[in-house]
């Protein structure tokens, strides 16, 4: 049932904060979708707590989550992908708290991969390319990507570029010469589906050429 439990046995449980957040990943394993939930308070005693999703499912009323250490997880084909589901934290048959969530609004894409940077000597620029599994998907195909790069010595001075394609050109003159750069990329749904940024791709490191003293241009590496 929706709302908070009122059973005397659960009085102690009711004092706890059972706030939780979830994200969905569509077609994460072939045609299977996943839903991952976790408590916002890491100190919640999860020993007897279960998660259940009801509604907006195909030919079943409810599904139970599997517990994987601190997170709760479902992998299934049975999401209707329209309308709101009721996700509840339960102790036995009693619901401690519930949230109505549309799974299409909490989509977290998979992280981009195969990030690489190629220097083009003639063009004096760097071509950044990466790949995403979403190009092959039926649902979450349209993504906005966030490419972030920084000089390795600048701990928190990231430059961000948003793009919808998987290719970006960085002009050599916008970068420091003879410097080591770190670059990474993440993605977020950008059409129909809504949600969260993916995890960052693994970082890629590249060095800019030195300046050629006679011409004032960088030397290729």
């Amino acid at each position: 049932e929706s709302g908070y439990a009122q059973n005397g046995d659960l009085e102690d449980a009711e004092l706890d904060d059972y706030s939780f957040s979830c994200y969905s990943q569509l077609e994460v394993n072939g045609s299977q979708h996943s839903l991952t939930c976790a408590f916002e308070d890491p100190d919640v005693n999860i020993t007897n707590l279960e998660f259940e999703i009801c509604g907006a499912l195909v030919e079943v009323k409810c599904l139970n989550f599997r517990k994987l250490q601190e997170i709760y997880f479902i992998e299934t084909k049975k999401f209707l992908l329209i309308g709101k589901s009721n996700i509840c934290v339960k102790v036995g048959e009693k619901s401690l708290t519930c949230k109505k969530i549309d799974l299409t609004t909490i989509v977290k894409p998979e992280a981009p991969f195969d990030l690489s940077v190629v220097y083009r000597e003639g063009a004096n620029d760097f071509v950044v390319t990466f790949n995403t599994s979403h190009l092959q998907k039926k649902y979450v195909k349209v993504l906005m990507h966030d490419v972030a790069y920084r000089q390795e010595k600048d701990e928190n001075k990231w430059t961000h570029v948003n793009l919808s394609s998987t290719k970006l050109t960085l002009l050599q003159r916008k970068l420091q010469p003879a410097a080591m750069y770190e670059i990474k990329v993440r993605s977020i749904p950008d059409h129909y589906f809504k949600g969260f940024w993916s995890e960052w791709s693994p970082s890629y490191y590249f060095r800019t050429p030195e300046i050629n003293n006679s011409s004032g241009e960088m030397d290729p590496i």
Partner: antibody, heavy 119, light 105 residues
Framework: QVQLVQSGAEVKKPGASVKVSCKAS????????MNWVRQAPGQGLEWMGL????????SYNQKFKGRVTLTRDTSISTAYMELSRLRSDDTAVYYC????????????WGQGTTVTVSS | EIVLTQSPATLSLSPGERATLSCSAS?????MHWYQQKPGQAPRPWIY???KLASGIPARFSGSGSGTDYTLTISSLEPEDFAVYYC????????FGGGTKVEIK
């Protein structure tokens, strides 16, 4: 205004199939489920199944699974319900109904299509 | 599958009287909806998610309940309220009750 307009009455013989259409207007067709509910003469309401028009995913009442097929054509905002292997007890009024995805109730209904199965 | 039992099957009352319609579920239901149907017409949404009135429904109607027992109440019957009312569970397979006919006494 939001409207669901269904195809006209049908008379079918036992063993035949019937296909009823439901044309939606006044809202984004792909944003709501389309449900099918039937009502036999003098009887109550019986949910048959639904389709998500965005992706074509269907969910059927087990009672009708294998006999009912729900489809849609998003280009003309129309949903279809086909019932095969008709029997005399399939004689009923068939309704399409839009599903409100926030609360899962049927907030807009078609006018109904009478299907008579008789030899 | 949940069975929804509506009682009474028929309720004979006069305009101005209070009507109480019951819907009992064979196991717990989180949300219940109600529809009104008049002869020869499609059902109309009446009350959704236990107690929320659908668009244009007058305030003399109210809904309540939890778990297995739900109620639709009409505080003072008007002539246009005489009809059949169906309850329905919110979740698959969206089962309807058998209906309660509210008729003029």
């Amino acid at each position: 205004q939001v409207q669901l307009v269904q195809s006209g009455a049908e008379v079918k013989k036992p063993g035949a199939s019937v296909k009823v259409s439901c044309k939606a207007s006044g809202y984004t067709f792909t944003g709501y489920t389309m449900n099918w509910v039937r009502q036999a003469p003098g009887q109550g309401l019986e949910w048959m199944g639904l389709i998500n028009p965005y992706n074509g995913v269907t969910s059927y009442n087990q009672k009708f699974k294998g006999r009912v097929t729900l489809t849609r054509d998003t280009s003309i905002s129309t949903a279809y319900m086909e019932l095969s292997r008709l029997r005399s007890d399939d004689t009923a009024v068939y309704y399409c109904a839009r599903g409100d995805g926030n609360y899962w109730y049927f907030d807009v209904w078609g006018q109904g299509t009478t299907v008579t199965v008789s030899s | 599958e949940i069975v929804l039992t509506q009682s009474p099957a028929t309720l004979s009352l006069s305009p101005g009287e209070r009507a109480t319609l019951s819907c009992s579920a064979s196991s717990s239901v989180t949300y219940m909806h109600w529809y009104q149907q008049k002869p020869g017409q499609a059902p109309r949404p009446w009350i959704y998610e236990i107690s929320k009135l659908a668009s244009g429904i007058p305030a003399r109607f109210s809904g309540s309940g939890s778990g297995t027992d739900y109620t639709l109440t009409i505080s003072s019957l008007e002539p246009e309220d005489f009809a059949v009312y169906y309850c329905q569970e919110w979740n698959y397979p969206y089962t309807f009750g058998g209906g309660t006919k509210v008729e003029i006494k």
